[in-house]
Interface confidence: medium
């Protein structure tokens, strides 16, 4: 079954290469277990950036080496992607799956265009 997922159209990463955005989903029921996946679309290629499964009311737990962190609040997930470079500029799509209890629901957002600008190197100082 499908559900709506909403996310901002555009986000600008900060000078440290960190971008944050909220992914919001229209939960048709009371899910207790939710899986959030961030996908990056460049041209026609879609790659998984990170994923986390969490229990409602608990923190999102990404893998230790993940570039993503996040928190949840109700039907909103606050996602932060770190370590971005200019070459990582692209469309970042939020996918939400309501894993438990049945029925299974899945929704995919329209994507957030994240712009990353590499900082200018500091000039040498005498």
């Amino acid at each position: 079954k499908a559900m709506h997922v909403a996310q901002p159209a555009v986000v600008l990463a900060n000078s440290r290469g960190t971008a944050s955005f909220v992914c919001e989903y229209a939960s048709p029921g009371k899910a207790t277990e939710v899986r959030v996946t961030v996908l990056r679309q460049a041209d026609s290629q879609v790659t998984e950036v990170c994923a986390a499964t969490y229990m409602m009311g608990n923190e999102l737990t990404f893998l230790d080496d993940s570039i993503c962190t996040g928190t949840s609040s109700g039907n909103q997930v606050n996602l932060t992607i770190q370590g971005l470079r200019a070459m990582d500029t692209g469309l970042y799509i939020c996918k939400v799956e309501l894993m438990y209890p049945p029925p299974y629901y899945m929704g995919i957002g329209n994507g957030t265009q994240i712009y990353v600008i590499d900082p200018e190197p500091c000039p040498d100082s005498d």
């Epitope: 559900m3 709506h4 909403a6 901002p8 159209a9 919001e24 229209a26 039907n75």
Partner: antibody, heavy 118, light 107 residues
Framework: QVQLVESGGGVVQPGRSLRLSCAAS????????MSWVRQAPGKGLEWVAE????????YHSDTVTGRFTISRDNSKNTLYLQMSSLRAEDTAVYYC???????????WGQGTLVTVSS | DIQMTQSPSSLSASVGDRVTITCRTS??????LNWYQQKPGKAPKLLIY???RLHSGVPSRFSGSGSGTDYTLTISSLQPEDFATYYC?????????FGGGTKVEIK
């Protein structure tokens, strides 16, 4: 069955404001993103604005950004389009549409005509 | 914004003819391509969504195909009620954009 009924159109002078409404019924309004699409007389379709199911996010076309604001009241099952600083080129039939899960506008209202003329 | 080039802009056909309308997008849209039918003085109606899925209540003579940047709407056997204007629309990327329309007229 799904029904979308627009109202609020009419003749307005350039520079003035108007608010369109769209009353929705026959589905769970608060679970769907909604849009406004317009069609100038004898012309094609042009997307104007969209709002997420809860109203958290809204998006507007470049041609109306800063002048038009989309909003919704889920307790009243109603979608709105507040239009200000109206121009002659805003003259069109304005349609309210529901966006389904595969990004298609699956249901449309009958439209309401907005005429901007001095 | 993604540009939508729809062709032809108009065509004349007879009842029973096979009609094909094409839509080309300026960027890859991963199949988020929809087709609408509009009759004079009426609101558009959804025919095909996600490239090839038939909306409920739409006759099976309508079909859609395509991928990447090239998409097609086909009416296998034109009926009297099919004379109308047809629009393609993409929502692979914001903002959603429409083609210029194809008017199908009686020959």
């Amino acid at each position: 069955q799904v029904q979308l009924v627009e109202s609020g159109g009419g003749v307005v002078q350039p520079g003035r404001s108007l608010r369109l409404s769209c009353a929705a019924s026959g589905f769970t309004f608060s679970n769907y993103a909604m849009s406004w699409v317009r069609q100038a007389p004898g012309k094609g379709l042009e997307w104007v604005a969209e709002i997420s199911y809860s109203g958290t996010y809204s998006y507007h076309s470049d041609t109306v950004t800063g002048r038009f604001t989309i909003s919704r009241d889920n307790s009243k099952n109603t979608l709105y389009l507040q239009m200000s600083s109206l121009r002659a080129e805003d003259t069109a039939v304005y349609y309210c549409t529901r966006r389904d899960y595969d990004n298609e506008m699956d249901y449309w209202g009958q439209g309401t005509l907005v005429t901007v003329s001095s | 914004d993604i540009q939508m080039t729809q062709s032809p802009s108009s065509l004349s056909a007879s009842v029973g003819d096979r009609v094909t309308i094409t839509c080309r997008t300026s960027q890859v849209i991963t199949n988020y391509l929809n087709w609408y039918q509009q009759k004079p003085g009426k609101a558009p109606k959804l025919l095909i969504y996600y490239t090839s899925r038939l909306h409920s209540g739409v006759p099976s003579r309508f079909s859609g195909s395509g991928s990447g940047t090239d998409y097609t709407l086909t009416i296998s056997s034109l009926q009297p009620e099919d004379f109308a204007t047809y629009y393609c629309q993409q929502f692979g990327k914001r903002p959603p954009t429409f083609g210029g329309g194809t008017k199908v007229e009686i020959k």
